[in-house]
């Protein structure tokens, strides 16, 4: 099953997976000035059998200028905020990770791909965190998060990582010897109180009805 929400955000840190469980989807996103080909794949899907897993579908991008029915609008400055998704990086898969049965490796890049990859993960997926450049990792426990199913809802475990503003970066697993870290607080696996809040889409009616979910502003 797909995880309903996204992996936790850790200040000054990014996450990535070493391998992707079957069922994982990768959005076919294109860089600015390009778009998916008409009726092209919306996402790649990690599929497979007991012996081999691979990515189904191919992402293809074409110049936005070739489709005159597409209205392309330059976003406002506030819309150019950096996306908090996994940054696309060169594949660095330890063989024992990417060769796991039922897992796919990092897909190769496609032409005119967006600079960041957006994955939709499935239950059981593990992602690893590292501090961004210029920040140092203080571990209270594992710097990883797992999507789990609890009481019919999906949730991500909380990575025990703090990134402090010192010029030393931590590494993803397999890149260098793991740092020793003090024991982290174990998460409860039984209490329903630990489940994450359901995601919401809601708004308020401007100054009139607090219970309405959409703000309507008359011009």
């Amino acid at each position: 099953e797909l995880c309903d929400d996204d992996p936790p955000e850790i200040p000054h840190a990014t996450f990535k997976a070493m391998a992707y469980k079957e069922g994982t989807m990768l959005n076919c996103e294109c860089k600015r000035g390009f778009r998916r080909i008409k009726s092209g794949s919306l996402y790649m899907l990690c599929t497979g059998n007991s012996s081999h897993s691979s990515w189904d579908n191919q992402c293809q991008c074409t110049s936005s200028a070739t489709r005159n029915t597409t209205k392309q609008v330059t976003p406002q400055p506030e819309e150019q905020k950096e996306r908090k998704t996994t940054e696309m990086q060169s594949p660095m898969q330890p063989v024992d990770q990417a060769s796991l049965p039922g897992h796919c490796r990092e897909p190769p890049p496609w032409e005119n791909e967006a600079t960041e990859r957006i994955y939709h993960f499935v239950v059981g997926q593990m992602v690893y965190y590292q501090c961004v450049q210029g920040y140092r990792a203080l571990h209270r426990g594992p710097a990883e998060s797992v999507c789990k199913m609890t009481h019919g809802k999906t949730r991500w475990t909380q990575p025990q990582l703090i990134c402090t503003g010192e010029m030393e970066t931590s590494q993803f697993p397999g890149e260098e010897k793991p740092q020793a870290s003090p024991e982290g607080r174990p998460e409860s696996e039984t209490s329903c109180l630990v489940t994450t809040t359901d995601f919401q889409i809601q708004t308020e009616m401007a100054a009139t009805m607090e219970t309405s979910i959409f703000t309507t502003e008359y011009q």
Partner: antibody, heavy 104, light 103 residues
Framework: PGGSLRLSCAAS????????MSWVRQAPGKGLEWVAN????????YYVDSVGGRFTISRDNAKNSLYLQMNSLRAEDTAVYYC??????????WGQGTLVTVSS | TQSPGTLSLSPGERATLSCRAS???????LAWYQQKPGQAPRLLIY???SRATGIPDRFSGNGSGTDFTLTISRLEPEDFAVYYC????????FGGGTKVEIK
């Protein structure tokens, strides 16, 4: 008819800036109709033909908000308008919706 | 095109809803939603056959190409609602809906 209205949708609980977002409407007693969608960074916007040139979709990722500016409103625009997150090729979750009535 | 427009059944019965596309639905980009009066649609099935999180296993989706079905194996009282299919080609499109009502 002919008036303007701006709808706002505030999202929480997911990484808003990582998803395409859509507006879907439903006329009273009728089925669902997709209206418009917008890419994560706002650089691509698409509309159903019937609202092209009159409606504008936009977003503010800093505020986790999605907007629909509706101009030159017509009676046939009367509907419940839902905002929804696009995930893969489907919509989930959906907002609760707001009724827009265009009448003289 | 969704058929039938209305399905009159009793609790415990099996419901089979049909969705037929005018063109082949690429990559099984087809979803099913349930909508109850005064509520927003709720995702049931995505990718033609995958159940969304928290959806009971009495709901199942099937099909490929142009013909898709949603099956409710044993209707529960809370299942009586309107069901929509939705495809994603160059843009999203919804079927006209099937109302499942109590006989």
């Amino acid at each position: 008819p002919g008036g303007s209205l701006r709808l706002s949708c505030a999202a929480s609980g997911f990484t808003f800036s990582s998803y395409w977002m859509s507006w879907v409407r439903q006329a009273p007693g009728k089925g669902l109709e997709w209206v418009a969608n917008i890419k994560q960074d706002g650089s691509e916007k698409y509309y159903v033909d019937s609202v092209g040139g009159r409606f504008t979709i936009s977003r503010d990722n800093a505020k986790n908000s999605l907007y629909l500016q509706m101009n030159s409103l017509r009676a046939e625009d009367t509907a419940v308008y839902y905002c929804a997150r696009e995930k893969g090729s489907w919509f989930d979750p959906w907002g609760q919706g707001t009724l827009v009535t265009v009448s003289s | 095109t969704q058929s039938p427009g209305t399905l009159s059944l009793s609790p415990g019965e099996r419901a089979t809803l049909s969705c037929r596309a005018s063109q082949s639905v690429s990559n099984n980009y087809l979803a099913w939603y349930q909508q109850k009066p005064g509520q927003a649609p709720r995702l049931l099935i995505y990718g033609a056959s995958s159940r969304a999180t928290g959806i009971p296993d009495r709901f199942s989706g099937n099909g490929s190409g142009t013909d898709f079905t949603l099956t409710i194996s044993r209707l529960e009282p809370e299942d009586f609602a309107v069901y929509y299919c939705q495809r994603y080609g160059s843009s999203p499109r919804f079927g006209g809906g099937t109302k499942v009502e109590i006989k």
